[in-house]
């Protein structure tokens, strides 16, 4: 009897949908695996007789529930199927946005870039998929614990009247208010302000 794949799960970030599993202990030799998806009531092969422990399902429709399954194989024997259900638009993790930061005197000027999507045109981003897409920004004075959060209305934001000659750190994430779903924070970007712009009298 061939044991089934273990710890079968979907790892999906920005619609890059990778079905992953672990190979079970099997004394007779090396196992191969076949992964399938349900399409119009028929299971279709996606990865056949692979020695890998993952299979890319990024070409699935972003909408709807998909039934995926994987089994282990050895010679002409095979395990039972292990099934999972996956809805990309609901289940995919929202990866960190890009961010450009520029210091202008005592201000930080930030521009945000929505994450790109696997199997899509360059210009079709997570913002196109989710109508309620917005950004959360948090910033703090480097070396302090107190963080401030803002929700920009646009793809850019300016933090004004900051302390001069002080390093501030900023990070951004995508947020979907209608789903109350937050994405992953970007890596902090830390920049030092320069002088303030007030002209001495």
């Amino acid at each position: 009897m061939v044991p089934p794949p273990e710890n079968v799960r979907m790892n999906s970030v920005n619609f890059k949908n990778i079905l992953q599993w672990e190979s079970p202990a099997f004394a007779k030799g090396n196992l191969t695996f076949t992964a399938q998806y349900l399409s119009y009531r028929i299971f279709q092969d996606k990865c056949m007789n692979t020695t890998l422990t993952e299979c890319d399902f990024s070409s699935l429709s972003k909408y709807g529930d998909h039934t995926l399954r994987v089994r282990a194989e050895f010679a002409d024997e095979h395990s039972d199927w292990v099934n999972i259900t996956f809805c990309p638009v609901d289940d995919t993790i929202i990866g960190p946005p890009g961010m450009q930061v520029e210091v202008l005197a005592d201000s930080l000027h930030m521009r945000f870039l929505a994450p790109k999507i696997e199997n899509e045109y360059e210009t079709w981003t997570m913002k196109n998929v989710y109508n309620s897409w917005t950004y959360n920004v948090q910033y703090w004075k480097n070396g302090t614990d107190e963080k401030f959060q803002i929700t920009p209305q646009y793809d850019f934001e300016v933090l004004r009247n900051l302390e001069p000659w002080t390093t501030y750190c900023v990070q951004v994430r995508g947020f979907l208010p209608d789903r109350n779903k937050a994405g992953e924070w970007s890596e902090p970007v830390c920049e030092q302000t320069t002088h303030d712009e007030t002209v001495p009298s």
Epitope: S61, Y63, E120, T123, W124
Partner: nanobody
């Protein structure tokens, strides 16, 4: 059932232009996303361009950017693909497709309705 009907294909010389049209028979083309795909001889289906109804944004494959323009005329319920500076590698059957959910642009899996296609041949 919605039927999409493409027209405007034909034989054109390299460097020439064509305008493809797509109409929904007896229906409006009021879908969140509508787009163009193509299939060259012996090749798989390839996304060419799409237009999003929510913000009228247009999106293109790198291979056609700057040469092809997608547009829609809501009053005529018609989708267009203006193809300029055509090359031999643009030879394909071109399909119009519509998505009910509008979540995707390039992947054929995100589209629900398809036309029968119109042949475009670029040759001297």
């Amino acid at each position: 059932e919605v039927q999409l009907v493409e027209s405007g294909g034909g034989l054109v010389q390299p460097g020439g232009s064509l305008r493809l049209s797509c109409a929904a028979s007896g229906n409006s083309l009021d879908y969140p996303t509508i787009g163009w795909f193509r299939q060259a001889p012996g090749k798989g289906l390839e996304g060419v361009s799409c237009i999003s109804a929510s913000d009228a944004s247009t999106h293109y494959a790198e291979s056609v950017k700057g040469r092809f323009t997608i547009s829609r005329d809501n009053s005529k319920n018609t989708l267009y693909l203006q193809m300029n500076s055509l090359r031999a590698e643009d030879t394909a059957v071109y399909y119009c497709a519509a998505s009910l959910h509008g979540l995707g642009c390039k992947s054929e899996a995100d589209y629900d309705y398809w036309g029968q296609g119109t042949q475009v041949t670029v040759s001297s």
